[in-house]
Amino acid sequence: LRLLDHRALVCSQPGLNCTVKNSTCLDDSWIHPRNLTPSSPKDLQIQLHFAHTQQGDLFPVAHIEWTLQTDASILYLEGAELSVLQLNTNERLCVRFEFLSKLRHHHRRWRFTFSHFVVDPDQEYEVTVHHLPKPIPDGDPNHQSKNFLVPDCEHARMKVTTPCMSSGSLWDPNITVETLEAHQLRVSFTLWNESTHYQILLTSFPHMENHSCFEHMHHIPAPRPEEFHQRSNVTLTLRNLKGCCRHQVQIQPFFSSCLNDCLRHSATVSCPEMPDTPEPIPDYMPLW
């Protein structure tokens, strides 16, 4: 988790002087509780947005937006703490909106936004906005939390972001798999424009089951420049196991930008359709 660039972040708007500060996620009001505290945020919304860094790289960011409740507690609102928690790693990053002037009621509801938390593809987050000062230990909570899911690199907009491109999102191998005679599979895919090796991972399953009955790995050496964007054809031999008929072929590239952690592509061959009630074959041919 990180903030997009480190240029001056702005939270001021007409009628409010405000500055964005780094935060330890432990506001002073936890340690020194105040008697009067503001109510919680209203209508917290988290959306996926995309933003360029000063270097021109494109990153997915969490766009956080919320409004204030129209009650007198805004007179005691000194700011807000924005927190993004990555669920799996428990990593948390916070910033603080510090209000440098008192809020006043005006003709429309106060609305705040922040779009500088960089998020990772295919990761899950919990976003919390805490109004400051935080409540006394037994006081009503004055925060609102929402969960937020970032799509993976197959998502159209995500595909062209810097982290996705670094993991090989622009490579479309267009995998085809066909079943040949004598328990063989023919795998064909398009090579990328990089002299790097590939690995084909074959996993076979019985019909309607998820426990594999055969696994095989095939190494493809790095192509020469004249082979870039060409089709690579590989024939894999299957184990002659009755019913081990559903095959998943996964291709793992080892591009220099992502090494062992590149996006993998896969294709599946289903088991052949079984006829519902096969016609009985007579043991003898009648003479009439």
């Epitope: 799996n88 428990n90 899950e124 929402k146 969960n147 899911l149």
Partner: antibody, heavy 116, light 107 residues
């Protein structure tokens, strides 16, 4: 090929405990959390909670708090779900699933029957 | 907790026809909604997340729409393998909750 393989069916008496395992393969185990979802016979799906495969952090459904414990063993890429003080209404198929908000890969399910 | 309500409970459709399934949340969940398909004796399969984003490998005949409290899953032309039970799930706030399911059966 991402796979989550669960332990076999269990029959337990009321008041007993059950521990179901879920072994993950085909991806970097610590990159995603594992959630548990159960389904009573002929019923819908009920979220039970999740565990972070990265650091063992957990979040449980409030109604199961105090009865459920989820643990992880990174050396074997296995997650465990233990449910204690079993009751007849805990009879269900228990599924492990990858991720913590939306579940993209699921185990095959483990039927736990609670009967005296 | 947020209550998810699916309708209808059962939907009878002929192969090749369009199926429209509804899911309603008891409060606004923005677009934090997923859809799953479950066939008898099998685990659920993720179809759609973020209201409208198809999961990896899901055919284009499945599409999702909606926002706030009203959501729809549309199967444009039902194939034989699409007859199953469909569940919606919100992941906006804890606890995560599922709808009761819609069974899509052959007419």
């Amino acid at each position: 090929q991402v796979q989550l393989v669960q332990s076999g069916a269990e029959v337990k008496k009321p008041g007993a405990s059950v521990k179901v395992s879920c072994k993950a393969s085909g991806y970097t185990f610590t990159s995603y959390g594992i959630s548990w979802v159960r389904q009573a016979p002929g019923q819908g799906l009920e979220w039970m909670g999740w565990i972070s495969a990265y650091n063992g952090n957990t979040k449980y459904a409030q109604k199961l708090q105090g009865r459920v414990t989820m643990t992880t063993d990174t050396s074997t890429s296995t997650v465990y779900m233990e449910l204690r003080s079993l009751r007849s209404d805990d009879t269900a198929v228990y599924y492990c699933a990858r991720k913590q908000l939306v579940f993209d890969y699921w185990g095959q399910g483990t039927l736990v029957t609670v009967s005296s | 907790e947020i209550v998810m309500t699916q309708s209808p409970a059962t939907l009878s459709v002929s192969p090749g026809e369009r199926a429209t399934l509804s899911c309603r949340a008891s409060q606004s969940i923005s677009t934090s909604l997923a859809w799953y398909q479950q066939k008898p004796g099998q685990a659920p399969r993720l179809l759609i997340y973020g209201t409208s984003t198809r999961a990896t490998g899901i055919p284009a005949r499945f599409s999702g729409s909606g926002s706030g409290t009203e959501f729809t899953l549309t199967i444009s032309s039902l194939q034989s393998e699409d007859f199953a039970v469909y569940f919606c799930q919100q992941y906006d706030i804890w606890p995560l909750t599922f709808g009761g399911g819609t069974k899509v059966e052959i007419k």
